[in-house]
C-alpha cells in the first residue's frame, strides 16, 4: 500500500501527488487525501494509504508532528499525527497546530511574533531520493543564525513557518521545504481526514489564513467523494 | 488557467531511449517546480523526476537514477524527461506535473511508454 516503503516512492495524492488542482479540462481537483487516477472526465480516490513514517516533526507536515501513535508506545515506531488544536494538551511546541504553541502543556494562541522552536544550525535532507542541485554544488545548506533577523521570503528554504515572513508558511517541496503564501479565502487546501493520514505530499500546501477554516465547497456538497473540493472558508 | 501537454511517448526497445516534454501554457502566476510521475498497469503512482526552479535542484527516484535526466526551462514553462537504458518495467503512463505559486498544482493527461523486451 502507498507509503508502506519510502524508497518505493510510492506517494500519496498522485498523479496528482499534489494536494489538489484547478478544474479545468484535462485536470482534476482534490483536496481530499487520496489518490486521484486520470482517465477521461472520471477520477477516483483511493483511501487506502499508511501513516508516514518519521524520525522528528521536520519530516511531517505544517499540522502534524511526530510521534508514536500509542500512548507509551515504542519509541521507535513513530508517525507523523494530526496537530493539538487550541486547548488541547501537549509537550512541545510541534505537537500544538499552526497559530499556536505549547504553554503549561496545553496548546495556546500564539501572537504573531512568537517563536515556535530552535532553528537547527544546518538542513540535511535524510530522505533515500537523489537531490541535486542543477549547479553541482553541495546538497548541506548551513544557515546562519544571522540569516533570522529577516524571515524567509517565499521560496526561501525554512525549516518551520517561524521562519517565514508574515503571511508565508513553511511547506513541503519535493524533498526540501520553502515558505509559501498561507491560504486566502477560497483558495483550494487540503483537508486531511485521518489522524496520521497525511503522508508525504510532495507539493504541499499551507494551510488557511487566520479565520478560516478548510471545509467542504458548498456546492460540492452534491458531488461524490471522491471529487469533493476542500476551500478555505469563513468560520 | 495552467494546461499541461505532454508528447514523446511511444513504444521502444528494452535499452533504448525517449525524451518526453511537458509544456505549460497559460501561467499567470510562478511556478516552484515541475515533476514527472508514472502509473504502470495495476501498480499505485510514483515519483519519477522532479526539477524546483525554486531551489534550482533537481529529485530522482532510485529506479531510474543514472538512467533518466530532467531538465527544463522555467522562462519557457518546459520541462524534459530523458530517459535512457530503459527496462520492461518503466512502461507506465507517464504524466507531468506543476506546483504553481497560486496554491494549485495542475497536471498533464499524461503520455504512454511502451518498453518491451
Known amino acids: 500500500t502507498l507509503n508502506s516503503v519510502l524508497n518505493s516512492n510510492a506517494i500519496k495524492n498522485l498523479p496528482p501527488p499534489l494536494g489538489g488542482a484547478a478544474g479545468h479540462p484535462g485536470s482534476a481537483v482534490s483536496a481530499a487525501p487520496g489518490i486521484l487516477y486520470p482517465g477521461g472526465n472520471k477520477y477516483q480516490t483511493i483511501d487506502n494509504y499508511q501513516p508516514y513514517p518519521c524520525a522528528e516533526d521536520e519530516e511531517c507536515g505544517t499540522d502534524e508532528y511526530c510521534a508514536s501513535p500509542t500512548r507509551g508506545g515504542d519509541a521507535g515506531v513513530q508517525i507523523c499525527l494530526a496537530c493539538r488544536k487550541r486547548r488541547k494538551r501537549c509537550m512541545r511546541h510541534a505537537m500544538c497546530c499552526p497559530g499556536n504553541y505549547c504553554k503549561n502543556g496545553i496548546c495556546v494562541s500564539s501572537d504573531q511574533n512568537h517563536f515556535r522552536g530552535e532553528i537547527e544550525e544546518t538542513i540535511t535532507e535524510s530522505f533515500g531520493n537523489d537531490h541535486s542541485t542543477l549547479d553541482g554544488y553541495s546538497r548541506r545548506t548551513t544557515l546562519s543564525s544571522k540569516m533570522y533577523h529577516t524571515k524567509g521570503q517565499e521560496g526561501s528554504v525554512c525549516l518551520r513557518s517561524s521562519d517565514c515572513a508574515s503571511g508565508l508558511c513553511c511547506a513541503r517541496h519535493f524533498w526540501s521545504k520553502i515558505c509559501k503564501p498561507v491560504l486566502k479565502e477560497g483558495q483550494v487546501c487540503t483537508k486531511h481526514r485521518r489522524k496520521g493520514s497525511h503522508g508525504l505530499e510532495i507539493f504541499q500546501r499551507c494551510y488557511c489564513g487566520e479565520g478560516l477554516s478548510c471545509r467542504i465547497q458548498k456546492d460540492h456538497h452534491q458531488a461524490s467523494n471522491s471529487s469533493r473540493l476542500h476551500t478555505c472558508q469563513r468560520h | 488557467e495552467v494546461q499541461l501537454v505532454e508528447s514523446g511517448g511511444g513504444l521502444v526497445q528494452a535499452g533504448g531511449s525517449l525524451r518526453l516534454s511537458c509544456a505549460a501554457s497559460?501561467?499567470?502566476?510562478?511556478?516552484?517546480?515541475m515533476g514527472w510521475f508514472r502509473q504502470a498497469p495495476g501498480k499505485e503512482h510514483e515519483f519519477v523526476a522532479g526539477?524546483?526552479?525554486?531551489?534550482?535542484?533537481?529529485y530522482y527516484a532510485d529506479s531510474v537514477k543514472g538512467r533518466f535526466t530532467i531538465s527544463g526551462d522555467n522562462a519557457k514553462n518546459t520541462v524534459y524527461l530523458q530517459m535512457n537504458s530503459l527496462k520492461p518495467e518503466d512502461t507506465a503512463v507517464y504524466y507531468c506535473?506543476?506546483?504553481?505559486?497560486?496554491?494549485?498544482?495542475?497536471w498533464g493527461q499524461g503520455t504512454q511508454v511502451t518498453v518491451s523486451s
Open positions: 526539477i524546483s526552479w525554486t531551489l534550482g535542484r533537481t
Open positions: 506535473a506543476s506546483n504553481e505559486s497560486d496554491a494549485y498544482n495542475y
Open positions: 497559460g501561467r499567470t502566476f510562478s511556478s516552484y517546480g
